[in-house]
């Protein structure tokens, strides 16, 4: 697993505790919650990284303040369970036995009900479409400059193969991102599209899950991109199974 | 290698003001917090605050409040202490520490000495 | 404000001596409690975080142990180069040190 070596960290998740125990004193990095060794070479799953966040010191709740215009936070958070591979399992339950299904994403994709409720798999996530808003301009953003500098950052930021972007829309003050990832498109060793979205966001809020580096500084041919809305939805490869009396409410 | 190197040693008058200064090197400035310790003679270890050179967000120790202001220059990658309002009880060793992603103070500058005496 | 109580003060041991200091919290911090060690004239340096976890370069004569609210820093044979004073820091909420523990030579 890659980690700086020289002072044992983690680049790619600061919710780790690294040590020079690995085999040969190689440095090894397990992540904050569940303890489970992260291959610091590449983006970590969400799900660790919820399991983390549930677990991490107060201090980095109250001391990383989300910027003046961060989103509204309201990412459903929870102490999830994943299995041996860093994946969300299926069935989600809280400790007052209440189980909800979710998708690859983290995402509730039933109704609740209680340990009796059956998950048979986990769904894939295969499309995610995340819309920004930014802060006024003196003019609009040149749509191919925007569309350049955006598809660069998930190739560089987050090692996202320029393949699952699928494409970028704009109309000011909107943008809208498109992720695609099929279960028969990912190869192993692909970032998913889930993390990339989800490290995304936090940077987004100013709440980056980098080690060592400064918050995301968005430019379009040197003219701050600052973003004050975001909005995300994902799009199961199977509909989501929610009773009519939800969706009429 | 990371360096945190800060300013030279400072005699002060009582009710005067000082700024002590504390230059990184050697990693990025702004992926890291940077704080502010105190060590008076023969006392304990003080933690004075924090910053967020990245935001420029501060955050202090209640018992420092409004004696102790910390900046930041992201240029030249310096965070900056000014204590005002110097009594013989500021007189210690002030040190500058990086806080590492999960916050424990990983790299620490040599210390400054402030005496303050009339 | 999270409290932490350190102890010995000092003490007083044997080159090849098994030292022993103790942190108490008031209030539970997890296991985000890190120790350093302090020569007189020079900055602190980083020997364990996280409770256990030794910093890169650090001897593993070093160790660290608990959770909560109770930690223990250990020498397991004390060195001519050890002498020095201990601290003990809680990284969860906020920032406080123990008030140190300074070890001598016998």
């Known amino acids: 697993h890659t980690a700086a070596q020289d002072n044992c960290t983690c680049p790619t998740n600061k919710m780790t505790v690294c040590s020079p125990d690995g085999p040969g004193g190689r440095c090894q990095c397990r992540a904050l919650g569940s303890g489970m060794a992260v291959d610091c070479s590449t983006l970590t799953s969400k799900c660790l990284l919820l399991k983390a966040r549930m677990s991490a010191p107060k201090n980095a709740r109250t001391l990383v303040r989300p910027s003046e215009h961060a989103l509204v936070d309201n990412d459903g958070l929870y102490d999830p369970d994943c299995d041996p591979e860093g994946r969300f399992k299926a069935r989600q339950c809280n400790q007052t036995s209440v189980c909800w299904c979710v998708n690859s994403v983290g995402v509730r994709r039933t109704d609740k009900g209680d340990l009796s409720l059956r998950c048979d798999e986990l769904v894939r996530t295969h499309h995610i479409l995340i819309d920004l808003r930014h802060r006024p301009t003196a003019g609009a953003f040149n749509h191919s400059d925007l569309d350049a500098e955006l598809r660069r950052l998930f190739r560089e930021r987050y090692r996202l193969h320029p393949k699952f972007v699928a494409a970028v829309h704009y109309e000011q003050p909107t943008i809208q991102i498109e992720l695609r990832q099929n279960t028969s498109q990912k190869a192993a060793g692909d970032v998913d599209i889930g993390d990339a979205a989800y490290y995304f966001e936090r940077d987004i809020k100013g709440e980056s899950l980098f080690q060592g580096r400064g918050g995301l500084d968005l430019r379009v041919r040197g003219e701050p991109l600052q973003v004050e809305r975001t909005l995300i939805y994902y799009l199961d490869e199977i509909p989501p199974k929610f009773s009519m009396k939800r969706l009429t409410a | 290698q990371v360096q945190l190197v800060q300013s030279g040693a400072e005699v002060k008058k009582p009710g005067a003001s000082v700024k002590v200064s504390c230059k990184a090197s050697g990693s990025s400035f702004t992926g890291y917090t940077m704080n502010w310790v105190k060590q008076a003679p023969g006392q304990c270890l003080e933690w004075i605050g924090i910053i967020n050179p990245y935001q420029g967000d501060t955050t202090y120790n209640q018992k420092f409040q409004g004696k102790v202001t910390i900046t930041v220059d992201k240029s030249t990658s310096t965070v900056y202490m000014e204590l005002s309002s110097l009594r013989s009880e500021d007189t210690a060793v002030y040190y500058c520490?990086?806080?590492?992603?999960?916050?424990?103070?990983?790299?620490w500058g040599q210390g400054t000495t402030v005496t303050v005496s009339s | 404000d999270i409290q932490m109580t350190q102890s010995p003060s000092s003490l007083s041991a044997s080159v090849g001596d098994r030292v022993t200091i103790t942190c108490q919290a008031s209030q539970d911090i997890n296991k985000y409690l890190a120790w350093y060690q302090k020569k007189p004239g020079k900055a602190p340096k980083l020997l364990i975080h996280y409770t256990s976890n030794l910093q890169t370069g650090v001897p593993s004569r070093f160790s660290g142990s608990g959770s909560g609210t109770d930690f223990t820093f250990t020498i397991s044979s004390l060195q001519p180069e050890d002498i020095a004073t201990y601290y003990c820091?809680?990284?969860?909420?906020?920032?406080?040190f123990g008030c140190g523990t300074k070890l001598e030579i016998k």
């Open positions: 520490a990086r806080g590492a992603g999960l916050y424990y103070f990983d790299y």
């Open positions: 820091l809680q990284y969860d909420d906020l920032f406080t």
